[in-house]
Amino acid sequence: APISSHCRLDKSNFQQPYITNRTFMLAKEASLADNNTDVRLIGEKLFHGVSMSERCYLMKQVLNFTLEEVLFPQSDRFQPYMQEVVPFLARLSNRLSTCHIEGDDLHIQRNVQKLKDTVKKLGESGEIKAIGELDLLFMSLRNACI
């Protein structure tokens, strides 16, 4: 399996009750506006064929996409949670900037691309869905990267 380097986050990032609560509240607010319950972004298909040691790199890719293509464009919605959660997630993204995989990451990019395609295909409702799954993103990052 490809070797991942610098794919680590300190546990303390996920032990801040206030921002954890705000992240979960933001996800819940968005999920209430999500009418498409047939599609799951962060689930079995995303992790398929990705070993445990590669998952932090996988989640870094998902985090970066979520920030750039979803949260920044939707930053005026779901206040006041959005204005607190986005900088927190951006800091995590910055801390993972040196997280790379040495070797072939095509299988990971394929899974991430499917997630991206799903969000794009659903349009704005795809973006809402991605925000509604921020709790899953948070917990997946936590388990994959600490």
Partner: antibody, heavy 119, light 108 residues
Framework: EVQLVQSGAEVKKPGASVKVSCQAS????????IHWVRQTPGQGFEWMGW????????RYAQKFQGWVTMTRDMSNTTAYMELPGLRDDDTAVYYC????????????WGQGTLVTVSS | QSVLTQPPSVSVAPGKTATITCGGN??????VHWYQQRPGQAPVLVIY???DRPSGIPERFSGSRSGNTATLTISRVEAGDEADFYC???????????FGGGTKLTVL
């Protein structure tokens, strides 16, 4: 077919130790966390912790930290849960369960191992 | 003492609809899973993430959420549905899954 097959029932005296095994088949062992959950008539279900088969890393519930030990053997795709210093109230059915992400969506469970602690 | 509250028992006639609830404080932002446990058997996941159904679980099983209460609904109940049902959720603050005390479903 995904299967988790656990070791048989155990009867132990207070203060003794028990080691329960959980053999996985039908999927890639290293791709799923193995959790241990126990069930008692009084307390219901109680999460004990998980082992990451790929790395051997563990996460334990606070109650079991420094007490339980969870390990795995990749060569025979088996996870183990060892609990020393047994007390009467550790009498329970102990389950292993697999989960993809490391939190709480258990898509497959072992059949359970009854551990009875009695003098 | 369970953090998630479920009614101890629910009774329903065959062919009717059974509703099992699960509630808890500060629970509204967390996702809920439901497990079915028949006597002497291991639990089986029947609903995850509030309303998703794993493959192989009949469409008669559905889940929903409203505020601090999650609901498992079983329509056209059959005798084989008789079991204990448990809700669970992940608490990111204590970093562990929590379980309800269970509801015994009796098919009359």
């Amino acid at each position: 077919e995904v299967q988790l097959v656990q070791s048989g029932a155990e009867v132990k005296k207070p203060g003794a130790s028990v080691k329960v095994s959980c053999q996985a088949s039908g999927y890639t062992f290293s791709d799923y966390y193995i959790h241990w959950v126990r069930q008692t008539p009084g307390q219901g279900f109680e999460w004990m912790g998980w082992v990451n088969p790929d790395t051997g890393g563990t996460r334990y519930a606070q109650k079991f930290q420094g007490w339980v030990t969870m390990t795995r053997d990749m060569s025979n795709t088996t996870a183990y849960m060892e609990l020393p210093g047994l007390r009467d109230d550790d009498t329970a059915v102990y389950y292993c369960a697999r989960d993809l992400t490391g939190y709480d969506q258990y898509t497959a469970w072992g059949q359970g191992t009854l551990v009875t602690v009695s003098s | 003492q369970s953090v998630l509250t479920q009614p101890p028992s629910v009774s329903v006639a065959p062919g009717k609809t059974a509703t099992i609830t699960c509630g808890g404080n500060n629970f509204r932002n967390k996702r809920v899973h439901w497990y079915q446990q028949r006597p002497g058997q291991a639990p089986v996941l029947v609903i995850y993430y509030d309303s998703d159904r794993p493959s192989g679980i009949p469409e008669r099983f559905s889940g929903s959420r409203s505020g601090n209460t999650a609901t498992l609904t079983i329509s056209r109940v059959e005798a084989g549905d008789e079991a204990d049902f448990y809700c669970s959720t992940f608490d990111p603050f204590t970093d562990r899954p929590l379980f309800g005390g269970g509801t015994k479903l009796t098919v009359l």
